[in-house]
């Protein structure tokens, strides 16, 4: 038969950061290939990654059409060298993914400190707004465009000469903090969606940036 010795995929897992979304699964294929289908709860199935020997499929193009929808994917297994035949009635083995809601579940990518500027005893720290693959009228949207006030940033800052950290929060991409004159400070930021109740609430910390290096500017 058309599906002899094919095994169903398993461990279907969504990997998603800033809406770049890939479905991964097992096993590595031996004499079989896979096709992925994706659907919203109310929509039709759309096939992607036809007869692939990979164990991942980039579904970003589908989910960015509506990041607030809930998606389901399934992975079909076919014998290697399979050619679609109109006469075949036997359904190949397949496995369903967990449901995936991008807006609630995509991980926040590592943020980047764009710049910092010192004026007297104040420092303005600016976080770079990351671009996503979500579009509006053929224009790519930033993370802030998508999440708006749902997205905040936490700034960790400390004197270069000590380890005691202070924190500040902003619902924009800028911080204005007080510093001691004559002291150098180091900074790291983290993106946070406070409304989330799960492990993907926070990003990893940005790379540390310290005063006295090229990203900074100092004015009296």
């Amino acid at each position: 038969s058309g599906t002899t010795n094919t095994v169903a995929a398993y461990n279907l897992t969504w990997k998603s950061t800033n809406f770049k979304t890939i479905l991964e699964w097992e096993p590595k294929p031996i004499n079989q290939v896979y096709t992925v289908q994706i659907s919203t709860k109310s929509g039709d199935w759309k096939s992607k990654c036809f007869y692939t020997a990979d164990t991942e499929c980039d579904l970003t193009d589908e989910i960015v059409k509506d990041v607030k929808q809930t998606y389901l994917a399934r992975v079909f297994s076919y014998p290697a060298g399979h050619v679609e035949s109109t006469g075949s009635t036997e359904e190949p083995p397949y496995e369903n993914s967990p449901e995936f809601t991008p807006y609630l579940e995509t991980n926040l990518g590592q943020p980047t400190i764009q710049s910092f500027e010192q004026v007297g005893t104040k420092v303005n720290v600016t976080v770079q707004d990351e671009w996503t693959l979500v579009r509006r009228n053929d224009t790519f949207l930033s993370l802030r465009d998508v999440f708006g006030k749902d997205l905040i940033y936490t700034l960790y800052y400390w004197k270069s000469s000590s380890s005691g950290k202070k924190t500040a929060k902003t619902n924009t991409n800028e911080f204005l903090i007080d510093v001691d004159k004559g002291e150098n400070y180091c900074f790291s930021v983290q993106a946070v969606i406070p409304s989330r109740r799960t492990a993907n609430r926070k990003s990893t910390d940005s790379p540390v940036e310290c005063m006295g290096h090229e990203k900074g500017e100092s004015r009296e």
């Epitope: 709860k41 509506d66 607030k68 929808q69 809930t70 809601t101 807006y103 609630l104 600016t126 976080v127 707004d129 509006r136 949207l141 930033s142 993370l143 802030r144 465009d145 998508v146 999440f147 708006g148 006030k149 749902d150 997205l151 619902n171 924009t172 991409n173 800028e174 406070p194 409304s195 989330r196 109740r197 799960t198």
Partner: antibody
């Protein structure tokens, strides 16, 4: 078609409790904030608070914090606004609304309103 | 809290003539990350719930006639109606959609002469 359907008008006495509802349909209920807005007779709009049904996260206006509770049951796509002890000054039209698709893009859809009258 | 102040509180306009409503916020509504102003305009027609007209200060909601336009940045915003029609009567509200608590202006009542 996106719809928000609110429960019917209520007449209550001071000190009584009340829960009004807002049922969403035609969209993914868990991913959009439901907003609650008060309009006292002949007055303007006042934002009370909101809830993201997918996580249950809420925000309240300081003017309403502690006096009302916002909740949601995502299994039936319904948000609630409740009072444990009503006052005459709670007499108003209460609207639920749904946030827009993009971040901070306003309240794109509104319920028809629930008129609450509190009188002894 | 951000305070939203609208002027005028009422205006009476002849059909076909333009109308303009000002809204000032006590703090900037400009998001530094994406350079968007999170200012929203609504119209509440008599006996109806409000309806969204403009978000991001100048983006018209789908289905809103192009005679409505929004402009401004930071703390000063304007809603313009290029040619007022009878169906435009009602109360117009601006709203801070930038930061919690979200706040509305007092409203501007538009009447037809």
């Amino acid at each position: 078609e996106v719809q928000l359907v609110q429960s019917g008008a209520e007449v209550k006495k001071p000190g009584e409790s009340l829960r009004i509802s807002c049922k969403g349909s035609g969209y993914t209920f868990i991913t959009y904030w439901i907003e609650w807005v008060r309009q006292m007779p002949g007055k303007g709009l006042e934002w009370m608070g909101d809830i993201l049904p997918g996580s249950g996260s809420t925000n309240y206006s300081p003017s309403f914090q502690g006096h009302v509770t916002i909740s949601a049951d995502k299994s039936i796509s319904t948000a609630y606004l409740q009072w444990s002890s009503l006052k005459a000054s709670d007499t108003a039209m209460y609207y639920c609304a749904r946030s827009g698709y993009y971040g901070n893009s306003g309240f794109a859809y509104w319920g028809q309103g629930t008129l609450v009258t509190v009188s002894s | 809290d951000i305070v939203m102040t609208q002027t005028p509180l009422s205006l009476s306009v002849t059909p076909g003539q333009p109308a303009s409503i000002s809204c000032k916020s006590s703090q900037s509504l400009l998001s530094s990350g994406n350079q968007k102003n999170y200012l929203t305009w609504y119209l509440q027609k008599p006996g109806q719930p409000p309806q969204l007209l403009i978000y991001w200060a100048s983006t018209r909601e789908s289905g809103v006639p192009d005679r409505f336009s929004g402009s401004g940045s930071g703390t000063d915003f304007t809603l313009k109606i290029s040619r007022v029609e009878a169906e435009d009567v009602g109360v117009y509200y601006c709203q801070n959609d930038y930061t919690y608590p979200l706040t509305f202006g007092q409203g501007t009542k538009l009447e037809i002469k």
